[in-house]
């Protein structure tokens, strides 16, 4: 993350990733002051003229916005005064991926951080067993992905094993035309054993288990973002 | 090595017009908002106009407002400034320089400009 | 408009300690910049963000600004940093100083 301490007061940012079409949080902290009024908050985008967001004298202040951030922006008025300059971004777009500066003045001077932010879809894939299939079948689906991610598939029996051959990805494109549902179907699936499929690019990883018994299916999803650092 | 070279600077009349160009190398071109900055004969440095990275947001110093005009061909990393209704003050050494946040980190060698019958 | 004052000329032996200043109305709140500008040449950024220095800029270039007044000191100066010198802020354009003329005796 990125800390300046040189123009006398710390800003702290986190790198994060942006889920297109949802809110994103742009995440940035500071020495609080004792007076919100004495408070200036402003978010600037390299490459863009206008300004990101503004908030000075306990309120937001617009007048320099960028058209490409008009109505999209927000920040978290009642924590300001604790320190939280973060950045709230609803629908985000693709194009709001970039480098982003946390800009801070208060009474006991000013300071400003960076933070890269990178932007694309990722979901939580769901495995089901495909009763319709010719043989034992496992189908991994996940609605939302960008950039085209990579599918591999894990099993806990057979650690380390190749399932390329034996199985078979498809990518189709949403209907906003950017972002892709991911299908990826594993054949000649034994019972008793737990498979993953685990899908990535360069922002998020996510992986769906399953496990298949006699008696019953267990599932489960997990999704984290690269390249942030909580 | 991150380069900008200007081009397309002359002799012209009152009245005329004239397109600079400049031309970037060694960085990701798109990603940088640019500026044109000129400086008349014995001044100092004036600012001119300014373009967003994505070329969809332009400012312009009210001496110039109307009369020209910044652009960018993202495809060919080249910068422009069209010049019309040229006047004898706007002859100047004209600069593009890479805008870096509040400032600019990267200029050009320039071009000269000269407007004269 | 937003406007910036600087000194026509400051004069400084060599290995002393040059100050440039640059006065606007509560400049201390905005990001101030500093260009060095030899004869002939396009100006080159020395000080950006106040006070940072950009890498192969000697460490003998500093900044500092708060309240209305933003300065620019150059410590045991050499002949080779005689120069023209620009501040500037961002205001919906980049504004310029009137430049300083930086004469090494």
């Known amino acids: 993350f990125g800390i300046s301490g040189r123009h006398s007061i710390t800003v702290t940012t986190v790198a994060s990733a942006g889920n297109i079409g949802e809110d994103g949080i742009l995440s940035c902290t500071f020495e609080p002051d004792i007076k919100l009024s004495d408070i200036v908050i402003q978010w600037l985008k390299e490459g863009v003229l206008g300004l990101v967001h503004e908030f000075k004298e306990g309120k937001d202040e617009l007048s320099e916005q960028d058209e490409m951030f008009r109505g999209r922006t927000a920040v978290f008025a009642d924590q300001v005064i604790v320190g939280n300059a973060s950045l709230r971004l609803k629908n985000v777009q693709l194009t709001d991926a970039g480098t982003y500066k946390c800009y801070i003045i208060t009474s006991k001077g000013k300071g400003n951080a960076n933070l890269e932010y990178k932007t694309g879809a990722f979901s939580m894939p769901e495995v089901n067993v495909d009763y319709n299939a010719s043989s034992e079948t496992l189908r991994c689906e996940a609605p939302r992905w960008f950039p085209q991610p990579t599918v591999v598939w894990a099993s806990q029996v057979d650690q380390g094993a190749n399932f390329s051959e034996v199985s078979n990805t498809s990518f189709e494109l949403n209907s906003e035309n950017v972002t892709m549902k991911v299908v990826s179907v594993l054949y000649n699936v034994t019972i008793n054993n737990t498979y993953s499929c685990m899908i990535e690019n360069d922002i998020a990883k996510a992986t769906g288990d399953i496990k298949v018994t006699e008696s019953e299916i267990k599932r489960r999803s997990h999704l984290q973002l690269l390249n942030s650092k909580a | 090595e991150v380069q900008l070279v200007e081009s397309g600077g002359g002799v012209v009349q009152p009245g005329r017009s004239l397109r600079l160009s400049c031309a970037a190398s060694?960085?990701?071109?798109?990603?940088?908002?640019m500026n044109w900055v000129r400086q008349a004969p014995g001044k100092g440095l004036e600012w001119v106009s300014a373009?967003?990275?994505?070329?969809?947001?332009?400012y312009y110093a009210d001496s110039v407002k109307g009369r020209f005009t910044i652009s960018r061909d993202n495809s060919k990393n080249t910068l422009y400034l069209q010049m019309n209704s040229l006047r004898a003050e706007d002859t100047a050494v004209y600069y593009c320089?890479?805008?870096?946040?509040?400032?600019?980190?990267?200029w050009g060698q320039g071009t000269t400009v000269t407007v004269s019958s | 408009s937003y406007e910036l004052t600087q000194p026509p000329s400051v004069s400084v032996a060599p290995g002393k300690t040059a100050r440039i200043t640059c006065g606007g109305n509560n400049i201390g709140s905005k990001s101030v910049h500093w260009y060095q500008q030899k004869p002939g040449q396009a100006p080159v950024l020395v000080v950006y963000d106040d006070s940072d220095r950009p890498s192969g800029i000697p460490e003998r270039f500093s900044g500092s600004n708060s309240g209305n007044t933003a300065t620019l000191t150059i410590s045991r100066v050499e002949a080779g940093d005689e120069a023209d010198y620009y501040c500037?802020?961002?205001?919906?354009?980049?504004?310029f100083g009137t430049g300083t003329k930086l004469t090494v005796l």
């Open positions: 320089a890479r805008k870096r946040w509040y400032g600019m980190d990267v």
């Open positions: 373009i967003s990275a994505s070329g969809a947001s332009r």
């Open positions: 500037q802020v961002w205001d919906r354009g980049m504004i």
């Open positions: 060694g960085f990701t071109f798109s990603d940088r908002a």
